[in-house]
């Protein structure tokens, strides 16, 4: 009976215990983006550093070609921050011909791709109008939440305008996930 | 063989199981900062409440002198929110001599200090230009991500301007970490 | 002795091990809010989708009547994002009679209700002045932190103005919690 002594009363026999240290985990950090062709109505995906500096992948969580590959089914916490920076948006002219402009915007989307499913699923979106008065601006969008993922799912981060992403520091723009 | 029955097939024998309830954890909340001399090009560190109200430290995670002390090596989720507030930035004059001003900014950095390493490591940064039009402004910067830390590492939160930090409520400005 | 072999040296005997897969967890997503009567100085609570699309509750974590019900005591990570959108605030008129206006604002509060305690506890608050120049604006407020909760505690998300909440997409506005 000795081997049972830590099992709580509501522990289902079929639910495996597992060491926390061997769970799939990744923290990816920004790199300078290579210019890519992308379609007008499709947000481009960022690519990431996965082993230098603060970045790592472990326990079968792999990064390949802009995607984090989910190695086992379960509930994952997924997060990303993207820092944007740009020059004054047209919007800051305040009023042209007496009427307000449509604001510019910045958007981050964390997307799940499942091979057996035709359409990607948007898991998280952070979107913000940008209508700045000063000469240049910068600001982060942070996202994070828990999702049930399946083995083989792929995660990526898409942005509305890749040229506005601040790629200068690994602590400003990042993407991560870990099995709970 | 009974004691093995919950071990999943991919469980490495050397990976210890451990109760979640005994993992190092802390949630610290804002207190009013004491008057301090600080150097021009150095972001001051915030100090925190660690036991009153919503704040706590547990399982050997200790808070001392502005630092959270990491008691064991592993992967930690670290987070902070700092709410800033201020009166109109000069930037809101919009244009001086016909050209936009350089914006003011607010920045939060979560920093790791390792005694054996000369330079602190910036783990997370949230930075935002502030160019507000109204008479006063307030806004939060939120950060959170996972990092591999070593026993003895110390974590702190630095801000660009300590006088702009909203210290009035424990739910507005906070800092926490937990072992995954 | 076999059943002990994964127990780390600092493991307290009384601390139960438990399978991660059976921990209480929930991720709720936005739905269109029904008009409700609420008192002037009280922020209205949002109600949520708990089973369709990306939303789920599991392992005795239940959602009922705007509340997430905590089924067992422990440390929980709680998070929410609310995306707000609106037309230009009056504040963008910049100066009336030579002095700036008081800014409009948007606020999210994650609140804990404990039946044995008369007053709700504000766990997390994100509050932001809104003083936009363009014709319409949109932006998210994200919150997340760890709290020690008791069995029977109830969690809700309150907002300063329910009519400004973007309910159009499940990835824009959400609320979740999971036992660590």
């Amino acid at each position: 009976l000795k081997g049972q002594e830590f099992a709580p009363s509501h522990q289902q026999v079929y639910a495996p215990l597992r060491a926390d240290g061997d769970k799939p985990r990744a923290h990816l950090t920004v790199v300078r983006q290579t210019p890519t062709q992308h379609f007008k109505n499709q947000f481009p995906a960022l690519h990431w550093e996965h082993e230098l500096g603060l970045a790592f992948t472990k326990n079968r969580m792999n990064y390949t070609n802009k995607f984090l590959l989910i190695p086992e089914s379960g509930d994952y916490f997924i997060y990303s921050q993207v820092t944007f920076r740009g020059m004054t948006s047209e919007c800051s002219e305040i009023r042209q011909a007496g009427r307000p402009n449509k604001p510019d915007s910045i958007t981050v989307v964390i997307t799940k791709v499942t091979d057996s499913y035709p359409e990607p699923t948007q898991l998280l979106m952070g979107t913000k109008s940008v209508c700045e008065v000063g000469s240049n601006w910068f600001q982060p969008i942070y996202l994070g939440a828990m999702f049930s993922l399946q083995e083989g799912d792929k995660l990526m981060v898409n942005v509305s305008d890749i040229s506005l992403v601040d790629y200068t520091k690994e602590d400003k723009t990042f993407f991560g996930a870990f099995l709970l | 063989l009974k004691g093995q029955e919950f071990a999943p097939s991919h469980q490495q024998v050397y990976a210890p199981l451990r109760a979640d309830g005994d993992k190092p954890r802390a949630h610290l909340t804002v207190v009013r900062q004491t008057p301090t001399q600080h150097f021009k090009n150095q972001f001051p560190a915030l100090h925190w409440e660690h036991e009153l109200g919503l704040a706590f430290t547990k399982n050997r995670m200790n808070y001392t002198n502005k630092f959270l002390l990491i008691p064991e090596s592993g992967d930690y989720f670290i987070y902070s929110q700092v709410t800033f507030r201020g009166m109109t930035s000069e930037c809101s004059e919009i244009r001086q001599a016909g050209r936009p001003n350089k914006p003011d900014s607010i920045t939060v950095v979560i920093t790791k200090v390792t005694d054996s390493y000369p330079e602190p490591t910036q783990l997370l940064m949230g930075t935002k230009s502030v160019c507000e039009v109204g008479s006063n402004w307030f806004q939060p910067i939120y950060l959170g991500a996972m990092f591999s830390l070593q026993e003895g590492d110390k974590l702190m939160v630095n801000v660009s301007d300590i006088s702009l930090v909203d210290y009035t409520k424990e739910d507005k400005t906070f800092f926490g970490a937990f072992l995954l | 002795l076999k059943g002990q072999e994964f127990a780390p040296s600092h493991q307290q005997v009384y601390a139960p091990l438990r399978a991660d897969g059976d921990k209480p967890r929930a991720h709720l997503t936005v739905v269109r809010q029904t008009p409700t009567q609420h008192f002037k100085n009280q922020f209205p609570a949002l109600h949520w989708e708990h089973e369709l699309g990306l939303a789920f509750t599991k392992n005795r974590m239940n959602y009922t009547n705007k509340f997430l019900l905590i089924p067992e005591s422990g440390d929980y990570f709680i998070y929410s994002q609310v995306t707000f959108r609106g037309m230009t605030s009056e504040c963008s008129e910049i100066r009336q009679a030579g002095r700036p206006n008081k800014p409009d604002s948007i606020t999210v509060v994650i609140t804990k209700v404990t039946d044995s305690y008369p007053e709700p506890t504000q766990l997390l608050m994100g509050t932001k002045s809104v003083c936009e120049v363009g014709s319409n604006w949109f932006q998210p407020i994200y919150l997340g932190a760890m709290f020690s909760l008791q069995e029977g505690d109830k969690l809700m998300v309150n907002v300063s103005d329910i009519s400004l909440v973007d309910y159009t997409k499940e990835d824009k506005t959400f609320f979740g919690a999971f036992l660590l």
Epitope: - | T34, E90, N136 | P100
Partner: antibody
Framework: QVQLVQSGAEVKKPGASVKVSCKAS????????INWVRQAPGQGLEWMGW????????GYAQKFQGRVTMTADRSTSTAYMELSSLRSEDTAVYYC????????????WGQGTLVTVSS | QSVLTQPPSVSGAPGQRVTISCTSS?????????VHWYQQLPGTAPKLLIE???NRPSGVPDRFSGSKSGTSASLTITGLLPEDEGDYYC??????????FGGGTKLTVLG
């Protein structure tokens, strides 16, 4: 209504200490910081420091560090300011003031306590 | 060390308008919570007149108003009354989180 009532005038010798009290009423004592401000005869106002009555945390002006101690007794809703190693230039009226949390302005003031330091 | 500078004295006849300036030696003065103004009538404790540059607490007549320009704040009193005579102080918080008071301005109502 909000009231801050201070203790009476004191005469002290150089090197001694003085402890001035400030009894609060008409509001929840632990919800607002108390500041202490002094005014030497014919001079302007000088800030000494703040006290959070809930936590007991304090913040002192550099000039008074090591000489001033601010405390609170929550059971009687009373704040105290003790100044040690008194010298003649500490002769002043000492005020307590309740702070507005959002703006840190001093909204309500005590009537003042005259402390005279003389040999 | 930051300093708030006020004119030592100003004066005006009843019904007139006077302005008292408060200039900061540092750009970070008032960045967080603004500049506040206090009135101290002879033999009494100071009273809050204006908070955060512009805002009048309830009970303060609208003859008193505050404004800001660059690193200066100003208190304007219109329709001067004899009972306005006294000392006026500006106050703020600096970047080291210390409260600062201006040196004070003595207002004399003439006649």
């Amino acid at each position: 209504q909000v009231q801050l009532v201070q203790s009476g005038a004191e005469v002290k010798k150089p090197g001694a200490s003085v402890k001035v009290s400030c009894k609060a009423s008409g509001y929840t004592f632990t919800s607002y910081d108390i500041n202490w401000v002094r005014q030497a005869p014919g001079q302007g106002l000088e800030w000494m420091g703040w006290l959070n009555p809930n936590s007991g945390y304090t913040g002192y002006a550099q000039k008074f560090q090591g000489r001033v101690t601010m405390t609170a007794d929550r059971s009687t809703s009373t704040a105290y300011m003790e100044l040690s190693s008194l010298r003649s230039e500490d002769t002043a009226v000492y005020y307590c003031a309740r702070e507005v949390p959002e703006t840190a302005a001093f909204e309500y003031w005590g009537q003042g306590t005259l402390v005279t330091v003389s040999s | 060390q930051s300093v708030l500078t006020q004119p030592p004295s100003v004066s005006g006849a009843p019904g007139q308008r006077v302005t008292i300036s408060c200039t900061s030696s540092s750009s970070d003065i008032g960045a967080g919570q603004g500049v506040h103004w206090y009135q101290q009538l002879p033999g009494t404790a100071p009273k809050l007149l204006i908070e955060g540059y512009y805002n009048r607490p309830s009970g303060v007549p609208d003859r008193f108003s505050g404004s800001k320009s660059g690193t200066s704040a100003s208190l304007t009193i219109t329709g001067l009354l004899p009972e306005d005579e006294g000392d006026y102080y500006c106050q703020s918080w600096d970047g080291t989180l210390s409260a600062l008071f201006g040196g004070g301005t003595k207002l004399t109502v003439l006649g």
